[in-house]
């Protein structure tokens, strides 16, 4: 059932999460800096069609739109997105040293992300089962394909936040 | 409620490998990264790594990369942290402590596992 | 990486007096989303670490409220309002904006 802006959600977890999304997304622009200034990959939009080559896939959230909220279903979106992140970010290990502890940061705030998510769905009763293992990552051939796959996780990801902020803070208004 | 049990004490050659286990119990044990931190005898905290059981991923120290090994093994809810090559300068007090985000991190430690290099 | 330096080293204090340590960021820890990323831990003889206060402000849960924590975006202060006996230890900051973590190099705490 649709659930609005007065959830049985704590406002505590909400500006918590509120906090670790803006984190992400500056990790994550912190990321598309350094590959716009080292490597001159500068436009994700150029780099659809590599994207769909290569099979790097996004994370849907529509269990999330305000107007029809689910909330069981929403935060199980946004953690199975957070887990589908972390395994594309695993899969651009070895980008480059210069964007190595960007990357290792950027990877530990999203799962840290996704334990918080999972915390609160615990304690509402509501967590779904563990996904035993990754679905099937994107390979990258060549360090070009690895670098332009960066640019590409980057920026779903930020859309995919962008989303996430959108929707925690109409959850987290009185 | 959550706790870390660590494995015991252990006297190591020069050259050898030790592996020391942490085993958590309380709490969904693959949500949570479980990190690895060196104390060495009258000295201060030192960050090794962490490893993400739900997806089996490790993080390292520089300083460390060359020689730490993090696993986890989720069906026992424990993670093992493996130092090969040891020298006399890896005497330390090796704790685990689980991961996590504003008061959660580091909120929970193991007892801590020392580990003795000796010939 | 993170360098944090902790003043003093050694702080002998009087039960009932205050006390004050201080830490220093190589870097700045305040992140763009207002969050300071510099923690407290206190380590009592013979025991693991504990977290005190976490995003430099905030007392960990169960923590006395005679511990406080402040600062600006590189320089730290851990006060403690009146010292008792039990607070003898090693105090730790660390930070966790980036990896690798690191933590300062401690600061002993004794009873005169």
């Known amino acids: 059932t649709p659930l609005g802006p007065a959830s049985s959600l704590p406002q505590s977890f909400l500006l918590k999460c509120l906090e670790q999304v803006r984190k992400i997304q500056g990790d994550g622009a912190a990321l598309q800096e350094k590959l716009c200034a080292t490597y001159k990959l500068c436009h994700p939009e150029e780099l659809v069609l590599l994207g769909h080559s290569l099979g790097i896939p996004w994370a849907p959230l529509s269990s999330c739109p305000s107007q029809a909220l689910q909330l069981a279903g929403c935060l199980s979106q946004l953690h199975s997105g957070l887990f589908l992140y972390q395994g594309l970010l695993q899969a651009l290990e070895g980008i480059s040293p210069e964007l190595g502890p960007t990357l290792d940061t950027l990877q530990l705030d999203v799962a840290d992300f996704a334990t918080t998510i999972w915390q609160q769905m615990e304690e509402l009763g509501m967590a779904p089962a563990l996904q035993p293992t990754q679905g099937a990552m994107p390979a990258f051939a060549s360090a070009f394909q690895r670098r332009a796959g960066g640019v590409l996780v980057a920026s779903h990801l930020q859309s995919f936040l962008e989303v996430s902020y959108r929707v925690l803070r109409h959850l987290a208004q009185p | 409620q959550v706790q870390l049990v660590q494995s015991g004490a252990e006297v190591k050659k020069p050259g050898a490998s030790v592996k020391v286990s942490c085993k958590a119990s309380?709490?969904?044990?693959?949500?949570?990264?479980m990190h690895w931190i060196k104390q060495a005898p009258g000295q201060g905290l030192e960050w090794i790594g962490y490893?993400?059981?739900?997806?089996?991923?490790?993080n390292y120290n520089q300083k460390f990369r060359d020689r730490a090994t993090l696993t986890a093994d989720k069906s026992t809810s424990t993670a093992y942290m493996e130092l090969s090559s040891l020298r006399s300068e890896d005497t330390a007090v090796y704790y685990c402590?689980?991961?996590?985000?504003?008061?959660?991190?580091?909120?929970?430690w193991g007892q801590g596992t020392l580990v003795t290099v000796s010939s | 990486d993170i360098v944090m330096t902790q003043s003093p080293l050694s702080l002998p204090v009087t039960p009932g007096e205050p006390a004050s340590i201080s830490c220093r960021s190589s870097k700045s820890l305040l992140h763009s989303n207002g969050i300071t990323y510099l923690y407290w831990y206190l380590q009592k003889p013979g025991q693991s670490p504990q977290l005190l206060i976490y995003?430099?402000?905030n007392l960990a849960s169960g923590v006395p409220d005679r511990f406080s924590g402040s600062g600006s975006g590189t320089d730290f202060t851990l006060k403690i309002s009146r010292v008792e006996a039990e607070d003898v230890g090693v105090y730790y900051c660390?930070?966790?904006?980036?990896?690798?973590?690191?933590f300062g190099q401690g600061t002993k705490l004794e009873i005169k």
């Open positions: 660390a930070q966790n904006l980036e990896l690798p973590y690191t």
């Open positions: 309380g709490y969904t044990f693959p949500i949570y990264t």
């Open positions: 995003q430099m402000s």
């Open positions: 402590a689980r991961g996590g985000y504003g008061d959660s991190l580091f909120a929970y």
């Open positions: 490893i993400n059981p739900s997806i089996g991923y490790a």
